[in-house]
Interface confidence: low
Amino acid sequence: SQVSNLLKQQQTNLTHQKNKLEGQISARQQAEEASQESQNELKEMIETLAWKLNEKSKEQMELHHQNLNLQETLKRVANCSAPCPQDWIWHEENCYLFSTGSFNWEKSQEKCLSLDAKLLKINSTADLDFIQQAISYSSFPFWMGLSRRNPSYPWLWEDGSPLMPHLFRIRGAVSQTYPSGTCAYIQRGAVYAENCILAAFSICQKKANLRAQ
Amino acid sequence: SQVSNLLKQQQTNLTHQKNKLEGQISARQQAEEASQESQNELKEMIETLAWKLNEKSKEQMELHHQNLNLQETLKRVANCSAPCPQDWIWHEENCYLFSTGSFNWEKSQEKCLSLDAKLLKINSTADLDFIQQAISYSSFPFWMGLSRRNPSYPWLWEDGSPLMPHLFRIRGAVSQTYPSGTCAYIQRGAVYAENCILAAFSICQKKANLRAQ
């Protein structure tokens, strides 16, 4: 009977421990379910954020493209409304560009044409004064749009008009005959005849955009 | 004895159940810890995404403002006249004039001021590239708006801002002291220190007129 009581007491203890453990398991199960729910919510939140981020990236890309387009338009419109494009000098009715590369006459002519311009044409002493001033700090020669096939031909501008004799005197190799023709360059305010095949800087010229702004 | 045996059997069962439950609790505890870790990771991921989203929003706001500004500028530029006066070169936001006379630094500064301009200021390598190109066909020196009282003073632009050291190295008489101060000129793409009293060509600069008329 004493053994029996002792066993009963142990059994009661074990039953109590078992109930307690079962309670703990139940609590943990609930916590686990809540945690799972919380985790699902977090995952949902991540999905939402990732989607929003993706959308924002798309919007940003779109804005960036809009920006680039606006900048492009701005460049074009600015060029349209200005008398001359960027890097050109506006003087009276013309725009002038002093080349930064050195090429033969024909190549220089092509470069000007690609910029919707022609090589320099001097129509008046005022034009000549401006050009002489503009290149006063350079010791280099600049091709202009004046050439002739050989010494028996007249000096002609690119548009086919003849050189007005009172404008300037052409110095240098005026009586030389070159296979590529004779071309005129301006250097330190004086105009010289030279072999068109030689490399020199050049001056491009085009009409200034003086339409109503 | 039969009761005793029965109790012992029940006790064995209970002990077995208790051990099983304890095992389950231990397993759940580990799972809970792993779940907690996973939750922490998810929270971190959320924080990162939220930060990224915030940054993107800021960037987008900035782009949006840029867009509005560009649209505004576009409206203004569309009905604006010449960005620069005659004989000046328009490049980006500025107008540049290459002097045709040779004067000391102070006189050159006065000449620019009389034209509502200042002596050249180089803010970036892009500015420097443009100026180097523009004077590439000249062997002459051009004053710029950079000077200092003596070698213990910093190089300052006319507006009082200091020279950014990465832009270019100043050569020549950098350690000389002159009564009129030391001024900087640009020649063939390099910048030199010189006595401000010497005469040189100069480059004037002013903001291009991109405002509405």
Partner: antibody, heavy 115, light 107 residues
């Protein structure tokens, strides 16, 4: 450091041509003009002309136009001066020198025109 | 063209003495003047640019002065290695022209 290495002495017949070279070392060849100077006991130092290797643009004194041709080879960082239709007047030492003021000089090339 | 004139072709000076070499331009050259030293068998060497700025490595006994059309190269405490011919050059405008040179000798 900066060095200009010129080609060796030349003995040439009257009427012939000669091409002198000047190799640039120690700096960016295209950044600086290369000038050429003639030296004789009678006329001293005379500037002939200059070439801008970056652009190929050249400038000559009137006296040497048609006599001297300046070229620059960017790939080898070498400047050349060709002298044509040589006469005894062209006998001299020719120097290549870097920009203005002339901060670096080649060692000089002696050209003797003789039959 | 701008002519550069060095009035003395020869100068004879005692060791340790002071020498002044003059150079006159036919027009104003705004201080764009260089001085060169040439020793027999060698190429010229740049001493001074901008009329007054001493080049790196040039002894401080050399100095330059002047303005407008008139310029001077001075050497104080003359040393044997200073025996050479000295040339001035204007580099304001092409053609860049040199003076005829002044040959310096020791007395």
């Amino acid at each position: 450091q900066v060095q200009l290495q010129q080609s060796g002495a030349e003995l040439v017949r009257p009427g012939a041509s000669v091409k002198l070279s000047c190799k640039a070392l120690g700096y960016t060849f295209t950044d600086y003009e290369m000038h050429w100077v003639k030296q004789t006991p009678v006329h001293g130092l005379e500037w002939i002309g200059a070439i801008h290797p970056g652009s190929g643009g050249a400038a000559y004194i009137q006296k040497f136009k048609g006599k001297a041709t300046l070229t620059a080879d960017k790939s080898s960082s070498t400047a050349h001066m060709e002298l044509s239709s040589l006469t005894s007047e062209d006998s001299a030492v020719y120097y290549c020198t870097r920009w203005l003021p002339m901060d670096y000089w080649g060692q000089g090339t002696s050209v003797t025109v003789s039959s | 063209d701008i002519q550069m004139t060095q009035s003395s072709s020869y100068l004879s000076v005692s060791l340790g003495g002071r020498v002044t070499i003059t150079c006159k331009a036919s027009d104003h050259i705004n201080n764009w003047l260089a001085w060169y030293q040439q020793k027999p068998g060698n190429a010229p060497r740049l001493l001074i640019s901008g009329a007054t700025s001493l080049e790196t490595g040039v002894p401080s006994r050399f100095s330059g002065s002047g303005s407008g059309k008139d310029y001077t190269l001075s050497i104080t405490g003359l040393q044997t290695e200073d025996v050479a011919t000295y040339y001035c050059q204007q580099y304001l405008i092409t053609p860049y022209t040199f003076g005829g040179g002044t040959k310096l000798e020791i007395k």
